[in-house]
């Protein structure tokens, strides 16, 4: 902490300005007040100041702010964000999407911090729960966020969300997230035809039954192999071999290539030879 | 509950083959979810996958063993055997059957057997 | 083959740590990535399985996470009877494959 020292005469600051760069960290400290800071935080991101400058405004936001800052300052922090532990972000409130979205643009390019996780958790908890908007936001700065959730948190994800997912951002997703989302995708995309519905499901297969799987079978949906690769599989086991020709189409060819991997192998080892020889694959179960 | 329980002699001589039967209590060699494994542990050493066999017959071996590996099914014993050939010293170590559940992995083990190769 | 690769191969930590086990495969394996846990003299425990369930009756201490080709075993609060030895395991291929362990040793 800074020591308590009465500013010099002349040195008081009467607006955020570059002549502050200037100021050492105690002059900081007692020339510059809290308030003033405040209101014109947007002018701080302008001004190059040292890290432990930073660190000199960032206690005076704290001690005029104890319980927490408000979102008119939350939203003009820009690079003190960097300075902010989880535990102070723990004391916001945030709940524009445009505050999220200027925080976010901060750590841009980065791994997700410990601070970024906690500001999302506190907003999407704000919320009740994880909007389109939101979601759109979130995984264009992190398209790998979605999979960062647990299955009890996606479960707070409504269909209607799920429009705004792209293939990539189910990448990483486990196939315990796959279950929690695929029927929210199954009730959002609905009302599609058939052709438009698979190319909007087929990431989100690696959470579908048995049953979906024998229906799409009879659809001519020609479903690649690395879709089909990401099924679960108790889901794929009770797949006749004529189901999974269907469910392939002209990509059938492609089993041979995987056939010692997961889950063709367990499908395959399940299935009568004389089916999988109707396939002209070479398989052996 | 499911029990798996290791058998067959303790001392094999070089160049003989080793001989080792799993019997399945509880439950049934005919799972269709089930495969049946060998594993194997050498003193101090960490754990090596021998080979697995479905209830119809099919198997897998481990490619480095494979020339010298048979595991093979009884379902009417509901017991699955393993049968190692040409040995040498550095095949001992403690021999574990176990059940390859489809959905999750080795969930169930045998206490496991030690065979040592030595003349 | 699909060569597993787990780091560190030791590691000392105290009751009540919080204890990260890395698991790398050679390449892809999906989710298809299990743990166990082996104490001496005792044939090995499946702790988690498709990378990230836990096996009925492991406590909620133990979690897994990762895909493709990177994995990690994680133990919130390290208690006595978690001083063991850690395996990785794959079973996308065929050719089943163990990582070669991690002794968990008291500090």
């Known amino acids: 902490e800074v020591e308590k020292t009465a500013c010099p005469s002349g040195k008081k600051a009467r607006e955020i300005d570059e002549s502050l760069i200037f100021y050492k960290k105690w002059e900081l400290e007692a020339c510059v007040d809290a308030a003033l800071l405040a209101t014109q935080m947007d002018r701080v991101n302008a001004i190059p100041f040292t890290y432990e400058q930073l660190d000199v405004l960032k206690h005076k936001l704290d001690e005029l702010y104890p319980q927490g800052y408000p979102e008119s300052v939350i939203q003009h922090l820009g690079y003190l964000f960097l300075k902010m532990s989880p535990e102070d972000i723990r004391k916001w409130n945030v709940t524009s999407l445009e505050t999220l979205k200027a925080l976010l643009e901060v750590n841009k390019g980065h791994e997700m911090s410990p601070q970024v996780a906690t500001l999302i958790d506190r907003f999407v908890k704000g919320r009740g729960q994880l909007d389109k908007d939101t979601l759109d936001t979130l995984t264009a700065f992190y398209p790998g966020y979605l999979c960062s959730l647990s299955p009890e948190e996606l479960s707070s994800v409504p269909p209607s969300s799920i429009w705004a997912v792209r293939p990539q951002d189910l990448d990483t997703c486990d196939p315990r997230q796959l279950d929690v989302l695929y029927p929210k995708a199954r009730l959002a995309f609905q009302n599609m035809n058939g052709s438009e519905y698979f190319v909007k499901i087929q990431s989100f297969l690696g959470g579908a039954p048995t049953e979906d799987l024998k229906a799409l079978s009879q659809q001519n949906v020609s479903m690649d192999l690395a879709t089909f690769m990401k099924l679960r599989t108790d889901a794929v086991l009770p797949l006749t071999v004529a189901e999974v020709q269907k469910l392939l189409g002209p990509h059938v060819e492609g089993l041979k290539a995987e056939e010692r991997h997961r889950p063709v192998r367990d499908w395959i080892l399940r299935q009568r030879q004389d089916d999988l020889d109707t396939l002209g694959l070479g398989l052996q179960g | 509950q499911v029990q798996l329980q290791e058998s067959g002699p303790g001392l094999v001589k070089p160049s003989e083959t080793l001989s080792l039967t799993c019997t399945v209590s509880?439950?049934?060699?005919?799972?269709?979810?089930?495969?049946w494994s060998w594993i194997r542990q050498p003193p101090g050493k960490g754990l090596e996958w021998i080979g697995y066999?479905?209830?119809?017959?099919?198997?897998n071996y481990n490619p480095s063993l494979k020339s010298r590996v048979t595991i093979s099914v009884d379902t009417s014993k509901n017991q699955f055997s393993l049968k190692l050939s040409s040995v040498t010293a550095a095949d001992t170590a403690v021999y574990y059957c176990?059940?390859?559940?489809?959905?999750?992995?080795?969930?169930?083990w045998g206490q496991g057997t030690m065979v040592t190769v030595s003349s | 083959d699909i060569q597993m690769t787990q780091s560190p191969s030791s590691l000392s930590a105290s009751v009540g740590d919080r204890v990260t086990i890395t698991c790398r495969a050679s390449?892809?394996?999906?989710?298809?990535l299990n743990w166990y846990q082996q104490k001496p003299g005792k044939a090995p425990k499946l702790l988690i399985y498709?990378?990230?369930s836990l096996q009925s009756g492991v406590p909620s201490r133990f979690s897994g996470s990762g895909s493709g080709t990177d994995f990690t075993l994680t133990i919130s609060s390290l208690q006595p009877e978690d001083f063991a030895t850690y395996y990785c395991?794959?079973?996308?291929?065929?050719?089943?494959?163990f990582g070669g362990g991690t002794k968990v040793e008291i500090k």
């Open positions: 498709a990378a990230s």
């Open positions: 395991q794959q079973s996308y291929d065929a050719s089943y494959t």
């Open positions: 066999i479905y209830y119809s017959g099919s198997t």
């Open positions: 176990a059940r390859d559940f489809v959905l999750s992995g080795f969930d169930i």
């Open positions: 390449q892809s394996i999906s989710s298809y």
């Open positions: 509880g439950g049934s060699v005919s799972s269709y979810h089930d495969l």
